[in-house]
């Protein structure tokens, strides 16, 4: 797995360099997670044809993966910094159960899956420090998450492969939207 941001050899070799600002650190963290997702998607898509045919292959999707909507204030039209930041943190917290599900779903990229999960936890901490209105952030219920995880893991192999693909695709889209929004803050 790649080295997490801020731990590469260049940082050791150049102690005189300006430390990253909070915004730069968040930006770098998201890009690091996106790189990890890319690697995981590569393994998933090489293993099956689900990446091309997921739309036609499904009649219904009840995964309830977090998604940016107009009302969340993260798009250019109707941009609202505080509302958007709450949405990003809430969405990442909701994704955590799905990232937990992804563990043990990869043969050659097991470390990469763990790195994506751990880096997301760090990203949430960075963002929580940035947020003023922490009370508006709802944390998912652990019992509900445990039940969801059981349901996901009980699915047949085909459904689990499709679920993996959909989680990675949605998480990538969510992070890309978050990155764009955070750059406006």
């Amino acid at each position: 797995a790649p080295v997490p941001p801020g731990e590469d050899s260049k940082d050791v070799a150049a102690p005189h360099r300006q430390p990253l600002t909070s915004s730069e650190r968040i930006d770098k963290q998201i890009r690091y997670i996106l790189d990890g997702i890319s690697a995981l998607r590569k393994e998933t898509c090489n293993k099956s044809n689900m990446c091309e045919s997921s739309k036609e292959a499904l009649a219904e999707n009840n995964l309830n993966l977090p998604k940016m909507a107009e009302k969340d204030g993260c798009f250019q039209s109707g941009f609202n910094e505080e509302t958007c930041l709450v949405k990003i943190i809430t969405g990442l917290l909701e994704f955590e159960v799905y990232l937990e599900y992804l563990q043990n779903r990869f043969e050659s990229s097991e470390e990469q899956a763990r790195a994506v999960q751990m880096s997301t936890k760090v990203l949430i901490q960075f963002l929580q420090k940035k947020a003023k209105n922490l009370d508006a952030i709802t944390t998912p219920d652990p019992t509900t998450n445990a039940s969801l995880l059981t349901k996901l893991q009980a699915q047949n192999q085909w459904l689990q492969d499709m679920t993996t693909h959909l989680i990675l695709r949605s998480f990538k889209e969510f992070l890309q939207s978050s990155l764009r929004a955070l750059r406006q803050m």
Partner: nanobody, 124 residues
């Protein structure tokens, strides 16, 4: 495990109707998505219709929309396929299938359980 017994097939004239049934044995029938597939001679098994176990929504292949109706009776552990305005190209073995999960697949590889199939022949 769930056992599926599909029935109701037969020979019918073009323009006629048939009602297929699929009886499921086993627990928690209402948690399963129920799906009808069909396979014509020399062709791949194709999706016909589905009744969601999560949302009670129904879904159809374009080729049967407006002619076929899928319904389920959770009290009787049974799913039905009402087929009207039948055409010779509807001739196939019809299979009932069941799958549990948060996704409802339209492909045969996604199913958990299968019935043995019931033959529908539509003559012109």
């Amino acid at each position: 495990a769930v056992q599926l017994v599909d029935s109701g097939g037969g020979l019918v004239q073009a323009g006629g109707s048939l009602r297929l049934s699929c009886a499921a044995s086993g627990r928690s029938f209402s948690n399963y998505h129920m799906v009808w597939f069909r396979q014509a001679p020399g062709k791949e098994r194709e999706f016909v219709a589905a009744a969601s176990g999560s949302t009670s929504s129904t879904y159809y292949a374009d080729s049967v929309k407006g002619r076929f109706t899928i319904s389920r009776d959770n009290a009787k552990n049974t799913v039905y396929l009402q087929m009207n305005s039948l055409k010779p190209e509807d001739t196939a073995v019809y299979y009932c299938a069941a799958v549990a999960g948060l996704l409802l697949p339209r492909v045969a590889e996604g199913m958990d359980y299968w019935g043995k199939g019931t033959l529908v022949t539509v003559s012109s």
